[in-house]
């Protein structure tokens, strides 16, 4: 029943070209190259892609032609290593080219940069974009793939093809509309926000595979798919997990052609077998390939089967618990996770994994005890505090969010996290805390039964952003500890951190708090980021500042910006009033 058992192909590149078709082949090779060589100009990448495509066509015509039997890693790596400016642009990454496969590909993967030094993407005027789209649609869309891929080196490649399809559809429709901007801009905003979320979700999957191994990813997948497909049997879920793990391992490993091909096969299998998987797949399965795969990945949870028996019979009361555990540990734990998850769509995946870990630890201890059953009889009682901790945390934070609104809730989190890990760079603290704060508007609107899976699994994605950014430039032992000790306990680890008493406050620098008239022309979002950056810096200067002190300073700051943006001579106002504000703030905080 393995979806991916294939006959051996003489030429892997010809096989993938035929499976995927020329358009998808070229798009995926462009994504792969842009994710590896993130600084290379667009034109250079297009040239490389065209060369690879022409070569693939010769292999399609004759699979026995010279070099057609080489692996994709060898072919693509050789092509990347022809880039003339490799050492000047990428430094030590050029040393990868001296290695043989598979070490060379591993080397390229290690040099992927989650925070590349690239200019922010600025959106041109709508008319300019529409002209560019009409002038050369193919180049316009390739440029989109290139710009997203190089900024998000772990973006899920087959899903990026889906985004590009929507991007094209938006321009096709809106560039003909009476009011182009009103039609196009909301669509582009939606794609941008969804794209960032998709990138972050995939980054967690890759981190899970790369830092914690296949077993960790499979456990996550068993829990999530069991919640989503509670009517499917364990054997079916296990099969889907095996196939999904292969797909994500390939994409996270840079094997984008194989990944896209296998994802298409998996979608086909799911749709052919939907009767034994889920009743919610019908609409998804009627869509074209890219939409189908996306739809399946986002499909709502199926209804739980009626009359599911108590878990205790098999996992606590049975005489065979230790026998089952000893003879097939991972199958037994997988079944536990499956049975628990399909009964609890109201739990986060990370909570389900904590419960499974607790169950595993208990069996490890108890199955070696004199009376195993007596020892593990109360194991389900140990779950209660683990379930209550996220429930209480979400309740408290949703109350705070409802009281403050998103911006002020983000500010509360900025203060909280800056006090926990003040060594982390200010841009990272602002970005991560803003995203953490979005959990309020994303999840607090949901009923109780949907809040935890929404909130805690979203927080896992955001905290992974902190972990990957921090890994690039480690500055805090506490962050390293929370990020590396346990994937499923990252959020509780960060939640448990108190104020870092070892932190030596930053020297006060008036320049940090000097503002200019350009702030007046910024969008509301950018203005918020400026204010939040100042707030983080304040806390770094005065970590013991109270909420009241910080609120007073921030209120003064908001009033100062509002006043000077209304002034005739804005720049003079910012200079003079700014000095007064800095002095007043220093006094208020006792700096």
């Amino acid at each position: 029943r393995g979806v991916f058992r294939r006959d051996a192909h003489k030429s892997e590149v010809a096989h993938r070209f035929k499976d995927l078709g020329e358009e998808n082949f070229k798009a995926l090779v462009l994504i792969a190259f842009a994710q590896y060589l993130q600084q290379c100009p667009f034109e250079d990448h297009v040239k490389l892609v065209n060369e690879v495509t022409e070569f693939a066509k010769t292999c399609v015509a004759d699979e026995s032609a010279e070099n057609c039997d080489k692996s994709l890693h060898t072919l693509f790596g050789d092509k990347l290593c022809t880039v003339a400016t490799l050492r000047e642009t990428y430094g030590e990454m050029a040393d990868c080219c001296a290695k043989q496969e598979p070490e060379r590909n591993e080397c390229f993967l290690q040099h992927k940069d989650d925070n590349p030094n690239l200019p922010r993407l600025v959106r041109p005027e709508v008319d300019v974009m529409c002209t560019a789209f009409h002038d050369n649609e193919e180049t316009f869309l390739k440029k989109y793939l290139y710009e997203i891929a190089r900024r998000h080196p772990y973006f899920y490649a087959p899903e990026l093809l889906f985004f590009a399809k929507r991007y094209k559809a938006a321009f096709t429709e809106c560039c003909q509309a009476a009011d182009k901007a009103a039609c196009l801009l909301p669509k582009l905003d939606e794609l941008r926000d969804e794209g960032k979320a998709s990138s972050a979700k995939q980054r967690l999957k890759c981190a899970s595979l790369q830092k914690f191994g296949e077993r960790a990813f499979k456990a996550w997948a068993v829990a999530r798919l069991s919640q989503r497909f509670p009517k499917a049997e364990f054997a079916e879920v296990s099969k889907l997990v095996t196939d999904l793990t292969k797909v994500h391992t390939e994409c996270c490993h840079g094997d984008l052609l194989e990944c896209a091909d296998d994802r298409a096969d998996l979608a086909k299998y799911i749709c052919e077998n939907q009767d034994s998987i889920s009743s919610k797949l019908k609409e998804c399965c009627e869509k074209p390939l890219l939409e189908k795969s996306h739809c399946i990945a986002e499909v709502e949870n199926d209804e739980m089967p009626a009359d599911l028996p108590s878990l205790a019979a098999d996992f606590v009361e049975s005489k065979d618990v230790c026998k089952n555990y000893a003879e097939a540990k991972d199958v037994f734990l997988g079944m536990f996770l499956y049975e628990y998850a399909r009964r609890h769509p109201d739990y986060s995946v990370v909570l389900l994994l904590r419960l499974a870990k607790t169950y595993e630890t208990t069996l490890e201890k108890c199955c070696a005890a004199a009376d195993p059953h007596e020892c593990y009889a109360k194991v389900f009682d140990e779950f209660k505090p683990l379930v209550e901790e996220p429930q209480n945390l979400i309740k408290q934070n949703c109350e705070l969010f409802e009281q403050l609104g998103e911006y002020k809730f983000q500010n509360a989190l900025l203060v909280r996290y800056t006090k926990k890990v003040p060594q982390v760079s200010t841009p990272t603290l602002v970005e991560v805390s803003r995203n953490l704060g979005k959990v309020g508007s994303k999840c607090c609107k949901h009923p109780e039964a949907k809040r935890m899976p929404c909130a805690e699994d979203y927080l896992s994605v955001v905290l992974n952003q902190l972990c990957v950014l921090h890994e690039k430039t480690p500055v805090s032992d506490r962050v390293t500890k929370c990020c590396t000790e346990s994937l499923v306990n990252r959020r509780p680890c960060f939640s448990a951190l108190e104020v870092d008493e070892t932190y030596v406050p930053k020297e006060f620098n008036a320049e940090t708090f000097t503002f200019h008239a350009d702030i007046c022309t910024l969008s509301e979002k950018e203005r918020q980021i400026k204010k939040q950056t100042a707030l983080v810096e304040l806390v770094k200067h005065k970590p013991k500042a109270t909420k009241e002190q910080l609120k007073a300073v921030m209120d003064d700051f908001a009033a100062f910006v509002e006043k000077c943006c209304k002034a005739d001579d804005k720049e003079t106002c910012f200079a003079e009033e700014g000095k007064k504000l800095v002095a007043a703030s220093q006094a208020a905080l006792g700096l």
């Epitope: 019979a313 098999d314 089952n324």
Partner: nanobody, 126 residues
């Protein structure tokens, strides 16, 4: 849906042997936890032996350990119970039961098995 059909019961002397068969249709028996239960007149249905699906772990009631052997032939989609050294107290109607989706766990609790055969009578008497 799973249909189960037992055969092989009959009258046997104490110390004798019998081999029960359970033919399954509608599902492959190798991916399903299957078990034999028995019910003597006036008594509760009790677990005799079980085998996991996919992972061939076997389970026995203490009263039959060493005397009975459960096995299956996946090519024939059939479950067997080889019963040796039979005793009068083994007299009962023997039922085959299946728990689809359970590749490993064979519970000893009868009401957790959704699929049952109609039973085959085993009488041990001299």
């Amino acid at each position: 849906e799973v249909q189960l059909l037992e055969s092989g019961g009959g009258l046997v002397q104490p110390g004798g042997s019998l081999r029960l068969s359970c033919a399954a249709s509608g599902r492959y028996i190798d991916s399903t936890a299957v078990a034999w239960f028995r019910q003597a007149p006036g008594k509760e249905r009790e677990f005799v032996a079980g085998i996991g699906g996919g992972v061939d772990i076997t389970y026995y009631a203490d009263s039959v350990k060493g005397r009975f052997t459960i096995s299956r032939d996946n090519s024939k989609n059939t479950l067997y119970l080889q019963m040796n050294s039979l005793r009068p107290e083994d007299t009962a109607v023997y039922y085959c039961a299946a728990r689809p989706g359970r590749p490993l766990i064979t519970s000893r609790v009868a009401n957790l098995y959704p699929y049952w055969g109609q039973g085959t009578l085993v009488t041990v008497s001299s």
